[in-house]
Amino acid sequence: MVADPPRDSKGLAAAEPTANGGLALASIEDQGAAAGGYCGSRDQVRRCLRANLLVLLTVVAVVAGVALGLGVSGAGGALALGPERLSAFVFPGELLLRLLRMIILPLVVCSLIGGAASLDPGALGRLGAWALLFFLVTTLLASALGVGLALALQPGAASAAINASVGAAGSAENAPSKEVLDSFLDLARNIFPSNLVSAAFRSYSTTYEERNITGTRVKVPVGQEVEGMNILGLVVFAIVFGVALRKLGPEGELLIRFFNSFNEATMVLVSWIMWYAPVGILFLVASKIVEMKDVRQLFISLGKYILCCLLGHAIHGLLVLPLIYFLFTRKNPYRFLWGIVTPLATAFGTSSSSATLPLMMKCVEENNGVAKHISRFILPIGATVNMDGAALFQCVAAVFIAQLSQQSLDFVKIITILVTATASSVGAAGIPAGGVLTLAIILEAVNLPVDHISLILAVDWLVDRSCTVLNVEGDALGAGLLQNYVDRTESRSTEPELIQVKSELPLDPLPVPTEEGNPLLKHYRGPAGDATVASEKESVM
């Protein structure tokens, strides 16, 4: 059992400065009651449970959700419940999604502005470049793993019988018929939103109209705004705006502090929402199972495809990513993962990386010792562009469809699938089921039939959850890696690269206890602008 953190004379955990000038618990990664340390006495067991109560509640919620869903399904499912009871059954989960989505906009914008403004341009560029490199490499690895697994396990050949039950006509109308070029142009357009206010709830998308031009019917691309937050545009704007504020120097300091304070307030809300998460997750998972028709038949006919996706996600998430993390940091990656179990379970429940972002930020900062300016800069970018899970699933799905329709995949096609999956996963941008839309682009790129996308959609409710878990895990490990990179470069250089915006007014350095809604955590403020010190962690590392 690892000893409790050393206490100072006032009973506070001894803290040391972090990279951004704040305070952090001494060697957070080395505290381990729950993460592999053993809980001996009754007192230690109690502390162990208290420290990990939220994690345990979340895991129990997922398991209970599956059990409840299967139970209700067995008792007649959605039909037996009836529309009114079903909507009441769905409500607690819907509420969690609404709470999380409510918080996304202020969190992403404020954290990125604050994060970008708190880094000098050189450090910002380096951090961003390393992050993007990590995201690119891991997404490519995920794609390669997906293709390899699908070629080895041959899920398409095994599921060929589903062709017969679906019928010859498949369901091509479900598949979005969009030009590959237009998809990437839309991505570029969304990076530069024409209206920041509408970007908060709308994205740009190209659709097509058939027009009669001199007796010939021609398909004309028509641009329109569609429902759904343009998170990509907001992320880019926030980063650029943060850099601009930084350039202003003292004039921009007030605004930077405003965004940082806004961010802190948002994180207080997040800590409150976290305690509702287990309830929401339970009902999100249960209601999804209840809504599904003929789950057993789907598993029989598409079992090998589902297995391929889940196995791929498990290998990438439990072996590949942790191995990369270990190779670069020489730290136990599973301890890191234990610290983010709550957001991972939330990712499984909500099926949205954006919705999981608030909880992920809170957990990597408080449980895994990632500095705020790193987590709040890297995680929103990761949630937008890092889609390991989606890329892996798309590759499995493309190979699955090729096998299902007996279409060959030569080396060139496999490379095309890898590259297109990696590139198009960027465009999925944290939207639930975005992966299925980008799958159509991949199929078009290698001339595979889109008819069978309806089959992929049939099990997307499960595979997409697994995708999201992997996506957010990749984001978090990326933040952890970058924290390690910053720690190493800072220990080598005397002049710190990452600066904290200093307060103009000297504030009382005495610790003032503040409750942040988490009944198990007492937070103490250090000097203004410094990181929060927690006397007990949700997940003691």
Partner: antibody
Framework: QIQLVQSGPELKKPGETVKISCKAS????????MSWVKQVPGKGLKWMGW????????IYGDDFKGRFAFSLETSASTAYLQINNVKNEDTATYFC?????????????WGQGTTLTVSS | DIQMTQTTSSLSASLGDRVTISCRAS??????LNWYQRKPHGTVKLLIY???RLHSGVPSRFSGSGSGTDYSLTISNLEQEDIATYFC?????????FGGGTKLEIK
């Protein structure tokens, strides 16, 4: 070279069963799907469905579910079309066609056709 | 299902002529358009796939073009052996559907 050789013409009475064969040569049989296409005299071509030659799973077009059955004898590189309880409207020429393994749905090699005449 | 329409059911031309046969789809088929030739009481042969790609062994006088919903097959220098019925077929979505055919005759 690649060849698809079909069995000879058939004359059947309504209610009988007919089985048409299609022997493939010159390529790996299980790599390419095998489709069946119907041509009624004086009319166009109509796709009946195809069989996944690797998995042995038949997929039928909407108008050909029920009395029609596709099957394989992989060791002999042969595909079969069986029509049960034949009717007068089944009078047509039936083609087996190798489904290309690229560019979605097209048929790069065809059998010579088997004429089925249903007459009482 | 996608409907394929060959407006000209029969066409007369002289040897050496340039002949164009057209085909229209009821919706955008994204270039998944193929052309077949059926000689009288003979077998069916693939000529062109994916709008314009020539199948192996097909003479270069055959060419294809088009996009969206409108496609055409061109025989640049008509020969006696080209007398046949020509079918277009969409391969975009299941079920694959064929045009009614255009019968090519000598004037």
């Amino acid at each position: 070279q690649i060849q698809l050789v079909q069995s000879g013409p058939e004359l059947k009475k309504p209610g009988e069963t007919v089985k048409i064969s299609c022997k493939a040569s010159g390529y790996t049989f299980t790599t390419f799907g095998m489709s069946w296409v119907k041509q009624v005299p004086g009319k166009g071509l109509k796709w009946m469905g195809w069989i996944h030659t690797y998995a042995g799973v038949p997929i039928y077009g909407d108008d050909f579910k029920g009395r029609f059955a596709f099957s394989l004898e992989t060791s002999a590189s042969t595909a079969y079309l069986q029509i049960n309880n034949v009717k007068n409207e089944d009078t047509a020429t039936y083609f087996c066609a190798r489904r290309s393994d690229n560019y979605r749905y097209f048929f790069d090699y065809w059998g010579q056709g088997t004429t089925l005449t249903v007459s009482s | 299902d996608i409907q394929m329409t060959q407006t000209t059911s029969s066409l007369s031309a002289s040897l050496g002529d340039r002949v164009t046969i057209s085909c229209r789809a009821s919706q955008d088929i994204r270039n998944y358009l193929n052309w077949y030739q059926r000689k009288p009481h003979g077998t069916v042969k693939l000529l062109i796939y994916y709008t314009s790609r020539l199948h192996s062994g097909v003479p270069s006088r055959f060419s294809g073009s088009g996009s969206g919903t409108d496609y055409s097959l061109t025989i640049s220098n008509l020969e006696q052996e080209d007398i046949a019925t020509y079918f277009c077929q969409q391969g975009h979505t299941l079920p694959p559907t064929f045009g009614g055919g255009t019968k090519l005759e000598i004037k």
